[in-house]
Amino acid sequence: LTCLGGFASPGPVPPSTALRELIEELVNITQNQKAPLCNGSMVWSINLTAGMYCAALESLINVSGCSAIEKTQRMLSGFCPHKVSAGQFSSLHVRDTKIEVAQFVKDLLLHLKKLFREGQFN
C-alpha cells in the first residue's frame, strides 16, 4: 500500500486523504494479523452512524499495550473534536456488546470503505 505521508507531513492534508490513510492503516492491521490482534482484547461495539469516529476512539482507547493499534488510535483522535481518555464512555445507555478488537477493526474498515466509495454520510 502506498504511504501518503499523512500525519507526518507538514501542513494540513485534505479530509479525503486523511480518511484514505485511516482506511489503509486498518487494511494493514487486518492483513498483517498473525497472532490474535491485541491478544484477543475485547472492546465495546459501536453504532456506525453520526459520531462514530469519537465512539470508535472511546472504545479503542481502552486497549493498552497493543502497538498494532496505536497508530489507529492516534489517527482517530484527528477525526474527533472531543477529548477522549481511557475509561471514558459518553453513552448514557449501558453498553452490552463486546467484540474482539480484530472484529471491531474489520467492521470499522468495511464501513469506512463503503462511506469512501459512496462519498456521503448525511
Partner: antibody, heavy 123, light 112 residues
Framework: QVQLQQSGAELARPGTSVKLSCKAS????????ISWVKQRTGQGLEWIGE????????YYNEKFRGKATLTADKSSSTAYMQLSSLTSEDSAVYFC????????????????WGQGTTLTVSS | DVVMTQTPLSLPVSLGDQASISCRSS???????????LHWYLQKPGQSPKLLIY???NRFSGVPDRFSGSGSGTDFTLKISRVEAEDLGVYFC?????????FGGGTKLEIK
C-alpha cells in the same frame, strides 16, 4: 423539510430542575447530532453540548457539565435537555440545533435550529 | 476556550450598499485535515439563528449569492454585496475546530 420543534416557555423556581424538548422531523434522526445552545438576553451564544441519537453518545462544554444532561428518544425523534439546580443565571433562551457532520469526520456545524425555549428562573 | 472577536459591534448601512463584517479567532481554526471550521449565522429579531456560510466560504442551501465568506487561519470576513431589508439582524461567526465550540459576540446590521 427539516424542522426542530421545541417545547414552550418555562417558569421555574430556583433550585428546581426543568426538562426541555426538541422534536425533529424531515430527516433521519439518528444520522445527525443534536446540539444545545444558550442565549441570555442581549448576549451572545454559548454551546452547551451535543448528543448523537444513533449511539446516545454525549459531549459537553465543561462549563455546563453537571448543569445540563442531554438525552434522546429515537422512537419519537426527540432530544431532551434537563437543567438542574436552577439559578437566575440559567434564565435564557435555549436553542436546539442539528449538528451536521460529514463522512470524513465528526467535525461539523449547526445547520438547522429550533425556535428556542425561554426559561425564566424566579422565586 | 477559543475567543471569537467580531468587528464592528454595529454596522449602519444604506440599502444597496456593501457590508463587511470581520471575525478574528484567538487561535488558528485550521484543522490538520485541511478544513477550517468557521461559520456564519444570521439571527433576526425574535428568531433563531440561521446558517449562512459554513467552513469559511460555502453558502448554505437557499442563501443568496450576495453573501460571501473568506479568510484563513485566524482572520475571516463576511461580505454582503448589496444589502437588502431582509438582511438586517445580528450576524454571528462561530468556530467548531476546537471544543468547546464558541461564537463571536455578534454584529448588528442596521439601517443608516
Amino acid at each position: 423539510q427539516v424542522q426542530l420543534q421545541q417545547s414552550g416557555a418555562e417558569l421555574a423556581r430556583p433550585g428546581t430542575s426543568v426538562k426541555l424538548s426538541c422534536k425533529a422531523s424531515g430527516y433521519t434522526f439518528t444520522t445527525y447530532g443534536i446540539s444545545w445552545v444558550k442565549q441570555r438576553t442581549g448576549q451572545g451564544l454559548e454551546w452547551i453540548g451535543e448528543i448523537y441519537p444513533g449511539s446516545y453518545n454525549t459531549y459537553y462544554n465543561e462549563k455546563f457539565r453537571g448543569k445540563a444532561t442531554l438525552t434522546a428518544d429515537k422512537s419519537s425523534s426527540t432530544a431532551y435537555m434537563q437543567l438542574s439546580s436552577l439559578t437566575s443565571e440559567d434564565s435564557a433562551v435555549y436553542f436546539c440545533s442539528r449538528w451536521r457532520t460529514s463522512y470524513f469526520s465528526d467535525y461539523g456545524y449547526f445547520d438547522y435550529w429550533g425556535q428556542g425555549t425561554t426559561l425564566t428562573v424566579s422565586s | 476556550d477559543v475567543v471569537m472577536t467580531q468587528t464592528p459591534l454595529s454596522l449602519p448601512v444604506s440599502l444597496g450598499d456593501q457590508a463587511s463584517i470581520s471575525c478574528r479567532s484567538s487561535q488558528s481554526l485550521v484543522h490538520s485535515h485541511g478544513n477550517t471550521y468557521l461559520h456564519w449565522y444570521l439571527q433576526k429579531p425574535g428568531q433563531s439563528p440561521k446558517l449562512l456560510i459554513y467552513t469559511v466560504s460555502n453558502r448554505f442551501s437557499g442563501v443568496p449569492d450576495r453573501f460571501s465568506g473568506s479568510g484563513s487561519g485566524t482572520d475571516f470576513t463576511l461580505k454582503i454585496s448589496r444589502v437588502e431589508a431582509e438582511d438586517l439582524g445580528v450576524y454571528f461567526c462561530s468556530q467548531s475546530t476546537h471544543v468547546p465550540y464558541t461564537f463571536g459576540g455578534g454584529t448588528k446590521l442596521e439601517i443608516k
